[in-house]
Amino acid sequence: APISSHCRLDKSNFQQPYITNRTFMLAKEASLADNNTDVRLIGEKLFHGVSMSERCYLMKQVLNFTLEEVLFPQSDRFQPYMQEVVPFLARLSNRLSTCHIEGDDLHIQRNVQKLKDTVKKLGESGEIKAIGELDLLFMSLRNACI
């Protein structure tokens, strides 16, 4: 089971209209450049077999991957949104640094790995798709962690 007290984000992190709006604007702009609408990264398959108490830990993994493998490499694109949204998401990642789960997290790692594999397989268009789903990442992170 997760060390649930550490797998929590305060509601106030998601009650900042300006950065929420910028995150959604960034997602909107990137989704216009996404020509692969058949694939969804953040959806039912990602959460399959994951209990309520494990969702935040899973989303922490997705957030960290998105930052390190997608947003940092693409940081020169989609300005001015990117330069505001990335530090915000990085702060959330930092706040979840002590979120771990005790015991087996293989099912979670397997689900996250499928997402990573999909992004990698699609190459740059996979990275654009991930940016285009930042609204879903934001909302899923909120719903899982508050």
Partner: antibody
Framework: EVQLVESGGGLVQPGGSLRLSCAVS????????MIWVRQAPGKGLEWIGI???????YYASWAKGRFTISRDSSKNTLYLQMNSLRAEDTAVYYC?????????????WGQGTLVTVSS | AVVLTQSPSSLSASVGDRVTITCQAS??????LAWYQQKPGKAPKLLIY???TLASGVPSRFSGSGSGTDFTLTISSLQPEDFATYYC??????????????FGGGTKVEIK
Amino acid sequence: EVQLVESGGGLVQPGGSLRLSCAVSGFSLSSYAMIWVRQAPGKGLEWIGIIDIDGSTYYASWAKGRFTISRDSSKNTLYLQMNSLRAEDTAVYYCARDRFVGVDIFDPWGQGTLVTVSS
Amino acid sequence: AVVLTQSPSSLSASVGDRVTITCQASEDIYTNLAWYQQKPGKAPKLLIYWASTLASGVPSRFSGSGSGTDFTLTISSLQPEDFATYYCQACVYGNSADSRYTFGGGTKVEIK
């Protein structure tokens, strides 16, 4: 094909008990949270409670103490135990699968089973 | 607990009409809203989630919009099979789990 079939409804006297069943096929109960929802005649939908993948249960405040959700994963069957039944518990009772996609969505639903509480 | 107020509670329309149903939440629910269709004697069926994402197999004449406290379900051109009752449903996280899921009172769409 995913299917949910409720059973166990019927006429029960006030103060009585009833156990409803929801037999599922096409997916494993151990991989999804499941909910119970009820609908009084001519009224709207009312959430009763949920059983999570790990077996944790959560109930609407009004249902706590009288209603208990459980499951038997080996039989792929969900249950709703209802005690101290009242006339106002008369309703169609539905089970539904909870698909978390970043937000909880209920899909699909069973066809429902009617519970009538009357003397 | 969040309260969802649907309006109108019922409406009469003709085949081909554009129909709009609103759902107002008593607090900010972001985009954590779904819409369900229920025909008489049948179980509810998921239409829309994330306020605007069409569920699999749902015709494109259905659309959803809104965020925060105000949401809309639109049927662009009403078909005979669309006469039913429509419910909005919210998920509220971060509070007690006993009030996480709430349904609106429903909107009955009848034949004019």
